[in-house]
Interface confidence: medium
């Protein structure tokens, strides 16, 4: 299993969440929210809705080595990964399922997608869950905008992502009580922060690629994904 994602990997996780396309078959999985930030110990709800006609629903945590968190099928005892046993509740039916993950830990930070088992497997658009230490809650915000299609996430690999030494999360935004004159500065800093996040994400990715086989699919795919994500700051996504 991949090692637990760190908050230092936020730029990469954000790129993943933004880069994941929604269901692209006739049957779709509607998934919400797209992104949520919660403190350690809190709970989060992820809802997966389909038009029916499925065998069951998996919730998969994405990353270099995807991991199935739960399997839910009406009338069957749900299967839960050992990491989450005793921390997961379900409500609704497999067609409209709400999965509640409790007592979240920093290591639970990641992108989660619903996988509906149908004639053609379909996938939700992904939920980026950011688990933060309580005192840093103001540092990490995510806008709940729909993800945009991009290059593939990395296929599974045998190695955990190394902890990048140079990456950092988005900078602390200015206080809400700042003077209106500071709005321009805020906008500038926000743009700068996003740009820095992209640069840092690429730095992390290059580290990962130099650390692993440079010819591997995972390496090139992470590069592609990061690049297209950064480009979306100023131009339409090339894969939409």
């Amino acid at each position: 299993m991949a090692g637990p994602p760190r908050l230092l990997l936020l730029p990469l996780l954000l790129a993943l969440a933004r880069g994941l396309p929604g269901a692209l078959a006739a049957q779709e999985v509607q998934q919400s929210p797209h992104c949520t930030t919660v403190p350690v110990g809190a709970s989060v709800n992820i809802t997966c809705s389909t038009s029916g006609g499925l065998r069951g629903i998996y919730l998969r945590q994405l990353g270099p080595q995807p991991q199935d968190i739960i399997y839910y099928e009406d009338g069957v005892v749900p299967t839960t990964d050992r990491r989450f046993r005793g921390r997961i509740d379900f409500s609704g039916s497999q067609d409209n399922l709400t999965i509640t993950m409790h007592r979240l830990q920093l290591s639970d930070t990641g992108t989660y997608t619903c996988q509906a088992i149908t004639e053609v497997n379909v996938y939700g658009s992904g939920t980026l869950v950011l688990v933060t230490e309580e005192q840093s809650q103001g540092w990490h915000r995510c806008s709940d905008a729909p993800p945009r299609a991009s290059a593939l996430p990395a296929p599974p690999t045998g190695s955990a992502l190394p902890d990048p030494q140079t990456a950092s999360a988005l900078p602390d935004p200015p206080a809400a009580s700042a003077l209106p004159a500071a709005l321009a500065v805020i906008s500038f800093l926000l743009g700068l922060g996003l740009g820095v996040a992209c640069v840092l994400a690429r730095t992390q990715i290059k580290k990962l690629c130099s650390w692993r086989d440079k010819n591997s699919a995972a390496c090139v795919v992470y590069e592609d994904m990061s690049h297209s994500r950064c480009n979306t700051l100023s131009s339409p996504n090339q894969y939409q």
Partner: antibody, heavy 118, light 110 residues
Framework: SVEESGGRLVTPGTPLTLTCTVS????????MCWVRQAPGKGLEYIGI?????SAYYASWATGRFTISKTSTTVDLKISSPTTEDTATYFC????????????????WGPGTLVTVSS | DIVMTQTPASVSEPVGGTVTIKCQAS??????LSWYQQKPGQPPKLLIY???KLTFGVSSRFRGSGSGTEYTLTISDLECADAATYYC????????????FGGGTEVVVK
């Protein structure tokens, strides 16, 4: 659906391009792989092309095959066929999040037969 | 490169019996394995993916298990229609390991 075409009898060394035509889904959303099967033998994975157009090959296939795509087709070019390349060639769609094939490959085309003989 | 070793090469069992096919990877592929069924003159059909997930519409008589380097496909209550060749495939991520097939197992139903 998925369907291969372009298979025929060729002489050794004559380049050949096979085409996989897809319908009902978009190649910008799914990866596609090529697999071959020599008469009476097992399946042999050749390579895959992802949604962004990057191709990855089995080590034995690197340099011998080239995978490329358009909006509705995926091509497999055999640069210099030998008699050992005589086989039925299949293309298949990758399943998995964003269409990558870590959930296997399905559907498959019926295959197209390539015969390399002098 | 990864090597997928499938055993046995051939097996014969009566209707109603059980067949077990094993697939061994030369390195850990952490459950990223698919099983296919192929009948003469037809393309392969995906049965199981991620080692144990049954493809929609496939009978629950087919069961996949295993992790790491050792995987098993079990077919119970054999039917005549199960006569086919079965292949395992690595779906593990790096380009050197990705996609490799086992050599196949021919299942004969008596």
């Amino acid at each position: 659906s998925v369907e291969e075409s372009g298979g025929r009898l060729v002489t050794p060394g004559t380049p050949l391009t096979l085409t996989c035509t897809v319908s009902g889904f978009s190649l910008s959303s799914f990866a596609m792989c090529w697999v071959r099967q020599a008469p009476g033998k097992g399946l042999e994975y050749i390579g895959i092309i992802n949604t962004g157009g990057s191709a990855y090959y089995a080590s034995w296939a690197t340099g011998r095959f080239t995978i490329s795509k358009t909006s509705t087709t995926v091509d497999l070019k055999i640069s210099s066929p030998t008699t050992e390349d005589t086989a039925t060639y299949f293309c298949a769609r990758g399943n998995g999040y964003a269409g990558y094939g870590y959930d296997g490959f399905d559907p498959w085309g019926p295959g197209t037969l390539v015969t390399v003989s002098s | 490169d990864i090597v997928m070793t499938q055993t046995p090469a051939s097996v014969s069992e009566p209707v109603g019996g059980t067949v077990t096919i094993k697939c061994q990877a030369s390195q850990s592929i952490t459950s990223w394995l698919s099983w296919y069924q192929q009948k003469p003159g037809q393309p392969p059909k995906l049965l199981i993916y991620a080692a144990s997930k049954l493809t929609f519409g496939v009978s629950s008589r087919f069961r996949g298990s295993g992790s790491g380097t050792e995987y098993t496909l079990t077919i119970s209550d054999l039917e005549c229609a199960d006569a086919a060749t079965y292949y395992c495939q690595s779906n593990y991520g790096s380009s050197s390991a990705y996609g490799a097939f086992g050599g196949g197992t021919e299942v004969v139903v008596k």
